[in-house]
């Protein structure tokens, strides 16, 4: 969480951003809030990116003002116009690119003053893993697959029964480059699985951590997946 202050006229206003991560090829949100102002026509929102000459986005007098927008963001940005009046300056970024990573500034002007805060935006790829029993294998085997990751993650297996056990000797992980030549498909196989146990396949890079759980009993198989972004710090 980054909280910034600015001084203008009577007041400085508080602007708050939250560091976040974008999943390349998908839409992302750069989060920014500010002390709301009841005078919508006086509110100006500017998004800037370090090292980029033009603006990322500008909203003023109740609408987008994109005449000074940098080419790399053309047609890819939008604020939540209906939410500006209640202090939401968050930016929607369409079709996130690897090159969108960097330091952004959310700069706000209202009738009460000015303020800004920086935001670290990481980009990569992350996806939910799915763990299945591999019935084609000669022994009881689990197969963990996740379709899109970047940068290359680590994969670690864990078990509820054998807590703390190291499964690296009985697992095999491969990374297969996807067609766009950036992201990779993650496949990890765990051998010598016992029933009546819960196994977890944990995939992690510097952006996200995802876990796929599978519980195998004689009568049923239960699965659960969870994904967590690692860098959601507010400013």
């Amino acid at each position: 969480l980054i909280i910034g202050f600015g001084i203008s006229g009577r007041h400085s206003i508080t602007v708050t951003t939250v560091a976040s991560a974008g999943n390349i090829g998908e839409d992302g949100i750069l989060s920014c809030t500010f002390e709301p102002d009841i005078k919508l026509s006086d509110i100006v929102i500017q998004w800037l990116k370090e090292g980029v000459l033009g603006l990322v986005h500008e909203f003023k007098e109740g609408k987008d003002e994109l005449s000074e927008q940098d080419e790399m963001f053309r047609g890819r940005t939008a604020v939540f116009a209906d939410q500006v009046i209640v202090g939401n300056a968050s930016l929607r970024l369409k079709n996130v690119q690897l090159t969108d990573a960097g330091t952004y500034k959310c700069y706000i002007i209202t009738s009460k003053g000015k303020g800004n805060a920086n935001l670290e935006y990481k980009t990569g790829a992350f996806s939910m893993p799915e763990v299945n029993v591999d019935y084609n294998a000669s022994s009881e085997t689990l197969r963990c697959e996740a379709p899109r990751w970047f940068p290359q993650p680590t994969v670690v297996w864990a078990s509820q029964v054998d807590q703390g056990a190291n499964f690296s000797e009985v697992s095999n992980t491969s990374f297969e480059l996807n067609s766009e030549n950036v992201t990779m498909k993650v496949v990890s196989v765990l051998y010598n699985v016992t029933i009546n146990n819960t196994y977890s396949c944990m995939i992690e890079n510097d952006i996200a951590k995802a876990t796929g759980d599978i519980k195998v009993t004689e009568s049923e198989i239960k699965r659960r997946s969870h994904l967590q972004l690692l860098n959601s710090k507010a400013s």
Epitope: H11, E35, S41, I85, V86
Partner: antibody, heavy 117, light 107 residues
Framework: EVQLVQSGAEVKKPGASVKVSCKVS????????MHWVRQAPGQGLEWIGA????????EYAPKFQGRVTLTADTSTSTAYMELSSLRSEDTAVYYC??????????WGQGTTVTVSS | DIQMTQSPSSLSASVGDRVTITCQAT??????LNWYQQKPGKPPKFAIY???QLAEGVPSRFSGSGSGTDYTLTISSLQPEDFATYYC?????????FGGGTKVEIK
């Protein structure tokens, strides 16, 4: 659940003052503007003013400037509207209304103020 | 101040009718317009925000449209519970201003 609960009806004499309260629950009171709107019998809605409780910033409609005072007690999440030098044309239902998710999204139940000699 | 002219001031309609209410601003309000429904003895109820977005719990027979200075609230098929007074509100320029209201009555 968001709730704005206002104080009860008041009967006042011309020249007197009235203070109406609005107790808020269900959202962060200090971080959003609270507005006051009134409605004379059989008439439309008229904006009086607004307060930002976190900083006690206030904005008033020019018509009410100098005669209305908006305050807030952040410890009890209660907003107050005081109108002075009352006259018969101030007879109305007075509403508090929040701007939490959108402009005037939640409303109090209203407080009837009657000014009569 | 921006003036909001709402029309008609009242209308009579039957259940099932399509009803249209308009609000005209004295200048461009850039879609910064909400609609409220009020029944006798009750506070106004938030119905439509930012010209066309339905508030939570509002039936899909209600819709809003418009841009610039001209805005419309439409009820596609009037239901018994829709008989009420409707107000528009502009919040683009300070101070916020309401339209004069439209009373929708049973024919």
């Amino acid at each position: 659940e968001v709730q704005l609960v206002q104080s009860g009806a008041e009967v006042k004499k011309p020249g007197a003052s009235v203070k109406v309260s609005c107790k808020v629950s269900g959202y962060p009171f200090t971080s959003y503007w609270m507005h006051w709107v009134r409605q004379a019998p059989g008439q439309g809605l008229e904006w009086i003013g607004a307060i930002y409780p976190g900083k006690s910033d206030t904005e008033y409609a020019p018509k009410f400037q100098g005669r209305v005072t908006l305050t807030a007690d952040t410890s009890t999440s209660t907003a107050y509207m005081e109108l002075s030098s009352l006259r018969s044309e101030d007879t109305a239902v007075y509403y508090c209304t929040s701007t939490w998710t959108h402009y005037f999204d939640y409303w109090g139940q209203g407080t009837t103020v009657t000014v009569s000699s | 101040d921006i003036q909001m002219t709402q029309s008609p001031s009242s209308l009579s309609a039957s259940v099932g009718d399509r009803v249209t209410i308009t609000c005209q601003a004295t200048q461009d309000i850039v879609k910064s317009l909400n609609w409220y429904q009020q029944k006798p003895g009750k506070p106004p109820k938030f119905a439509i925000y930012y010209t066309a977005q339905l508030a939570e719990g509002v039936p899909s027979r209600f819709s809003g449209s418009g841009s610039g200075t001209d805005y419309t609230l439409t009820i596609s098929s009037l239901q018994p519970e829709d008989f009420a007074t409707y107000y528009c509100l502009q919040f683009y320029e300070f101070p916020p201003t309401f339209g004069g209201g439209t009373k929708v009555e049973i024919k």
